[in-house]
């Protein structure tokens, strides 16, 4: 069986301030079992944007039904974008465990923020 891939199709996305940004991510397999998390930036200082398993992320909604047992689409929408949201976003698959361990990351999508149209 093919090893799971994390597909972030868009290298970059540009959104006007105040609008919502859709960041696309799909995985190619249901195995291994474990949650998806979204981060802004890479490395130890990366910022958690969304955790499928737990947490409260008021500006983030999932594009499809991520609770569905066989869901492989983990795209998210971030509302009310501001210039402070600019950066590279990574969709990361974790393997279930105690604790969950990082399994594979997507290639990243760079979000740039345009000035609000007057």
């Amino acid at each position: 069986e093919e090893e799971l891939q994390v597909i972030q199709p868009d290298k970059s996305v540009s959104v006007a301030a105040g609008e919502s940004a859709i960041l696309h991510c799909t995985v190619t397999s249901l195995i291994p079992v474990g949650p998806i998390q979204w981060f802004r930036g890479a490395g130890p200082a990366r910022e958690l944007i969304y955790n499928q398993k737990e947490g409260h992320f008021p500006r983030v909604t999932t594009v499809s039904e991520s609770t569905k047992r066989e869901n492989m689409d983990f795209s998210i929408s971030i509302s009310n974008i501001t210039p402070a949201d600019a950066g590279t976003y990574y969709c990361v698959k974790f393997r279930k465990g105690s604790p969950d361990t990082e399994f594979k990351s997507g290639a990243g999508t760079e979000l740039s923020v345009r000035a609000k149209p007057s």
């Epitope: 199709p9 868009d10 290298k11 799909t26």
Partner: antibody, heavy 119, light 103 residues
């Protein structure tokens, strides 16, 4: 075996309408995004439109936006393309394609149906 | 836009690489069309994945903004037009096509 069979092509005049159909078999149609791709005579492949598995989200190329409408009937395993205000540059073979996990990748294609727009 | 060479040639039994670059895609696919108007066939999707009905002589790889289709042990029946495809709709999805001539 996956099969995609297009129909509905033909010769029409500029400004007229046409509805293409694609009948799918050999896979669980309702689980997959579906796409129309076209190829004008002597030209390369051009993405036209994609529809989500449930049918609630559609994507269009700028060249057809506002004129073409993609739809599907999961109970009939069928995909459609309603083409209005047809122009000469819409003349092409229209292929129906099954999208893989990410919707701009295609794993199976139909044989195509020819649309000719001419006065 | 996705950029690929208009034509390449290869010796029978040899190896050929077709490259494609540019656009706003993180991932790529490859499609073969044996004659104009015939149905395209998917060779590679998501960079490296090959459908089960495609011979193992076709392989794909991606590095940065460039994806490469490699045909190892080129056969006469591989003479065709090869299109790369991107994963982002901003690319228009397809390159202009590369014609492979088998010598």
């Amino acid at each position: 075996d996956v099969q995609l069979v297009e129909s509905g092509g033909g010769v029409v005049r500029p400004g007229e309408s046409l509805r293409l159909s694609c009948e799918a078999s050999g896979f669980t149609f309702r689980n997959y995004y579906m796409t129309w791709v076209r190829q004008a005579p002597g030209e390369g492949l051009e993405w036209v439109s994609t529809i989500s598995d449930t049918g609630d989200t559609a994507y269009y190329a700028d060249s057809v936006k506002g004129r073409f409408t993609i739809s599907r009937d999961n109970s009939k395993n069928s995909l459609y393309l309603q083409m209005n205000s047809l122009r000469a540059d819409d003349t092409a073979i229209y292929y129906c394609a099954k999208s893989w996990i990410w919707w701009t990748f295609f794993d199976y294609w139909g044989l195509g149906t020819l649309v000719t727009v001419s006065s | 836009a996705l950029t690929q060479p208009a034509s390449v040639s290869a010796n029978l039994g040899g190896t050929v690489e077709i490259t494609c670059s540019g656009g706003n895609s993180n991932h790529y696919g490859w499609y073969q069309q044996k004659s104009p108007g015939s149905a395209p066939v998917t060779l590679i999707y998501a960079d490296t994945n090959r459908p089960s009905n495609i011979p193992s002589r076709f392989s794909g790889s991606t590095s940065g903004s460039t994806t490469t289709l490699t045909i190892t042990g080129v056969q006469a029946e591989d003479e065709a037009v090869y299109y790369c495809g991107g994963s982002s709709t901003g690319d228009g999805i397809f390159g202009a096509g590369t014609t492979l001539t088998v010598l």
